[in-house]
Interface confidence: low
């Protein structure tokens, strides 16, 4: 008899999922030698046990601890780059500022990084057909659940001058739904963060307005503000440019506005 | 349309070499990582190297690491993989793939977009 199985409005778990994140621990921990003496088969033990036979709208932080203990990871706190709405970019970044990093440069970042998974309630078995969505099903689903636990240990850990990455080309360039704006906006820690700097990204070749006077932006600074954390802003009118001059800051044309 | 076309591959002894090219267009080549992998007759398709979007990042099969180089030109959109010292287990067909990203993740689950391959034959 075939069994009924709920479905979801998003899609299933990405296939090969469990192949998948093994074979991503294993190359991390080969790429970075500080993490050499991470065990990938207890990594991918912690990551099934947090969702595997649990409702998959019934999700909690604490199903995801002996994760975050295994992915335990120290990054220079002065060098964390989080970004908004604009992924590539932000690891375009720091691929060539090697000593900054996003959230998907930490190794628990890595591997869940473009993943979707589920499972199902009292079954071993990992939900390939679909997987909740989080506006239409519920909030408190594995994928959602997990990248909240790890960017507010991420936002945590931040100190000094924090840097965000925004999208300049949306409506809002400040979403104060997204991640950035519901997680890690709220978990930097005034004790230890003095600045958080954005960049707005130009979209346009010929878009010279000052979008740090964006009403978002402004939103965004009201908060910032208010947890005693100092605001500043840069536009960065030529990510193309941007890229190459944090490559070779001693061009002669790096001297210009960027 | 995005394309991606191997050339290069060929007949050679044990010990020799080969330069593969892999001419890319329809996107923006210098925007993302690429690969290259291989499949052997009978065999599952096996990863070979990768190469970070602007070329600062290489990384290899343990198979071929100190052997072949994986590099690329940005302004011509071509990526290459020079083999040297050529044994008869490389005989295969190689393909360059694009990655979806700038190379955040070296496995082939992020591949989406691949060439048609290129034969490398090695015998005596």
């Known amino acids: 008899v075939p069994r009924w199985r709920q479905q979801w409005s998003g899609p299933g778990t990405t296939k090969r999922f469990p192949e998948t994140v093994l074979a991503r621990c294993v190359k991390y921990t080969e790429i970075h030698p500080e993490m050499r003496h991470v065990d990938c088969q207890s990594v991918w033990d912690a990551f099934k046990g947090a969702f595997i036979s649990k409702h998959p709208c019934n999700i909690t932080e604490e199903d995801y601890q002996p994760l975050m203990k295994l992915g335990t990871q120290t990054v220079p706190c002065n060098k964390i780059l989080l970004w908004s709405r604009i992924k590539d970019l932000a690891h375009q970044f720091t691929q060539v500022q090697r000593d900054m990093f996003t959230l998907e440069d930490t190794l628990l970042g890595y591997l869940a990084d473009d993943l979707t998974w589920c499972g199902e309630f009292n079954t071993s078995k990992i939900n390939y057909q679909s997987c909740p969505d989080w506006r239409k099903d519920c909030s408190n689903n594995p994928v959602s659940v997990f990248w909240k636990t790890v960017s507010r240990r991420f936002a945590e850990a931040a100190c000094d001058v924090v840097h965000v990455m925004l999208n300049g080309s949306r409506s809002k360039i400040f979403d104060k739904n997204s991640t950035f704006g519901s997680v890690e906006v709220h978990n930097l820690q005034p004790e230890k963060v003095q600045t958080l700097e954005a960049w707005v990204i130009h979209g346009g070749r010929e878009d010279s307005r000052d979008l740090c006077q964006d009403p978002t932006i402004k939103e965004l600074e009201s908060i910032i503000s208010k947890r005693n954390i100092q605001f500043s802003c840069k536009n960065i009118y030529r990510p193309d440019k941007f890229l190459q001059c944090v490559k070779n800051p001693e061009d002669s044309s790096c001297t210009s506005e960027i | 349309q995005v394309q991606l076309v191997e050339s290069g591959g060929g007949l050679v002894q044990p010990g020799g070499s080969l330069r593969l090219s892999c001419a890319a267009s329809g996107f923006t080549f210098s925007g993302y990582g690429m690969h290259w992998l291989r499949q052997a007759p009978g065999k599952e398709r096996e990863w070979v190297a990768v190469i970070s979007y602007d070329g600062s990042n290489k990384y290899y099969a343990d198979s071929v690491k100190g052997r072949f180089t994986i590099s690329r030109d940005n302004s011509k959109n071509t990526l290459y993989l020079q083999m040297n010292s050529l044994r008869v287990e490389d005989t295969a067909v190689y393909y360059c793939?694009?990655?979806?990203?700038?190379?955040?993740?070296?496995?082939?689950?992020?591949?989406?977009?691949w060439g048609q391959g290129t034969l490398v034959t090695v015998s005596s």
């Open positions: 793939a694009k990655d979806r990203g700038t190379m955040r993740v070296v496995v082939y689950d992020t591949l989406d977009i």
